[in-house]
Every structure is written in C-alpha cells, then in structure tokens.
C-alpha cells in the first residue's frame, strides 16, 4: 500500500500504448 | 543552470558499504523522476537504478537488487545511492542522470560529471 | 535476456554522412534514445523518441527505428562530433537497455 504523502504522485510504469504513445515505453499516471 | 554534481565515491573492500549523493540545482527537483547509470573503466553504460515522484516507485537492475537503494530528499534536492555488500564488479564511474520531463520519460536528459568507485581489496 | 547490439566502431570522413546502428528484438516497437560522449566526459542526449531532437542538437543528427534496428544518423558529419555513441531503450520497467557503444571517427 502507497503511503499517504504519494497518493497524489505520479507512477511511473513501463507498458505499450500508454500515455498517448503508439509503442513501448514509460509512461506516468496519476 | 540545470547541473547535477555526483559525490561519494571512493576506494573500498569487497564486502563494504557506501553512499553517493547527488546535488540538483537550477531546476524543480522533486518534479522530475532520476536514475542512476554507471560506466566501468573502458566500458559501456549500465543502468542502475530510478526513483520516480513518489518515494515508494523505484526500480532496480537485477545486477544490484537487494544490494542497493535508491532514495531521495527533495527538501535538499539530493539523490542517493546506498550501496552495501561490494563487488569488484560494481567498480565504475557512477552517474546520476534525469529523466525526462512529462508523462513519458524514456530518455536521460541531463547526467552528472559522475563519481569513481572502485572496488578492491 | 534482450541486448541492444552496436558495431564498435565506424569511421566517416568530414562532410560524409556517419550512420550507426543499434539492434535489438523488437526494439522498433519501443522508443530508442542516443547519447553522445566525448572522451572523458559524461553523455549527452542526441536523439528520443526514436527521432526527437533536445533543444541545442544540431539539425544534423537525426534518427530511426523500425523492424529489430533504430538508427542514428549524422549529415555533414563535422571534427567535433567524434565520439562515442551509445542507444538505449526500455525493455520492462526494470530493464533500462544501452547499446555497448559505438567509437565515431572523423578521418
């Protein structure tokens, strides 16, 4: 579970077709 | 301007421990995630590890996990790097580096002069 | 386990065009990054995004990627671009991949 003071912190994960991106990469979602 | 400075590095044992710093100015620290890359003598670069916004989003490279930690202090503007239990193959110069800023940040946009560790007995 | 494969070496004479490449399986479905680095100092992003420049690249270096191989590309190359050259991709979140590098020599 995340702690409090990261709620509201982007994560940053790797995946494909992810934040407006055709291919494979990091993408970082509230 | 935008510079990052790399500190704590040195010579030691196998078996030993140290902590890198590395001191960010002249951008908004706590809004960009930062890795670490290293480069032994002569060699390629490996990356090491990252820390994203958040405290608890971080990622190592198989060939260090378990054995080191990244962290960070944004209210100091500082990465760290702890590294326990050397080997004679983490011997390198150690970088830090910024990742690029927005919501998708594959590149290192900005690295450290770096730091020699070197690791012997 | 994924490699990004580069050639050690490749030499262009000034003014020619230097190509350099980097491959890897599947490494056209990811973006590729490359970064130069002169003798004795610490890299410096040239391309992202595949074909991205970062404010103060010059115009002559551009990139590609498709298939297994991206692709770096340098028009009129000039002295001061002799160094090395390495790419990199993300493979997992936890697999950050850089080429081994590739020497540019400017005859």
């Known amino acids: 579970r995340r702690r409090r003071r990261d709620t509201h912190f982007p994560i940053c994960i790797f995946c494909c077709g992810c934040c407006h991106r055709s291919k494979c990469g990091m993408c970082c979602k509230t | 301007q935008v510079q990052l400075v790399e500190s704590g590095g040195g010579v030691v044992q196998p078996g030993r421990s140290l902590r890198l710093s590395c001191a960010a100015s002249?951008?908004?620290?706590?809004?960009?995630?930062m890795h670490w890359v290293r480069q032994a003598p002569g060699k390629g670069l490996e990356w090491v590890a990252v820390?994203?916004?958040?405290?608890?989003?971080?990622y190592y490279a198989d060939s260090v996990k378990g054995r080191f930690t990244i962290s960070r202090d944004n209210s100091k503007n500082t990465l760290y790097l702890q590294m326990n239990s050397l080997r004679a193959e983490d011997t390198a110069v150690y970088y830090c580096a910024r990742a690029q800023e927005g919501i998708a940040p594959d590149a290192f946009d900005i690295w450290g002069q770096g730091t020699m560790v070197t690791v012997s007995s | 386990s994924y490699e990004l494969t580069q050639p050690p070496s490749v030499s262009v004479s000034p003014g020619q065009t230097a190509t350099i490449t980097c491959s890897g399986d599947k490494l056209g479905e990811r973006y590729a990054c490359w970064y130069q680095q002169r003798p004795g100092q610490s890299p410096v992003l040239v391309i992202y995004?595949?074909?991205k420049r970062p404010s103060g690249i010059p115009e002559r270096f551009s990139g590609s990627n498709s298939g297994n191989t991206a692709t770096l590309t340098i028009s009129g190359t000039q002295a001061m671009d002799e160094a090395d050259y390495f790419c990199q991709a993300w493979y997992s979140s936890t697999n950050v991949l850089f080429g081994g590098g590739t020497k540019l020599t400017v005859l």
């Open positions: 002249g951008f908004t620290f706590s809004s960009y995630g």
């Open positions: 820390i994203w916004y958040a405290e608890s989003n971080k």
């Open positions: 995004q595949d074909i």
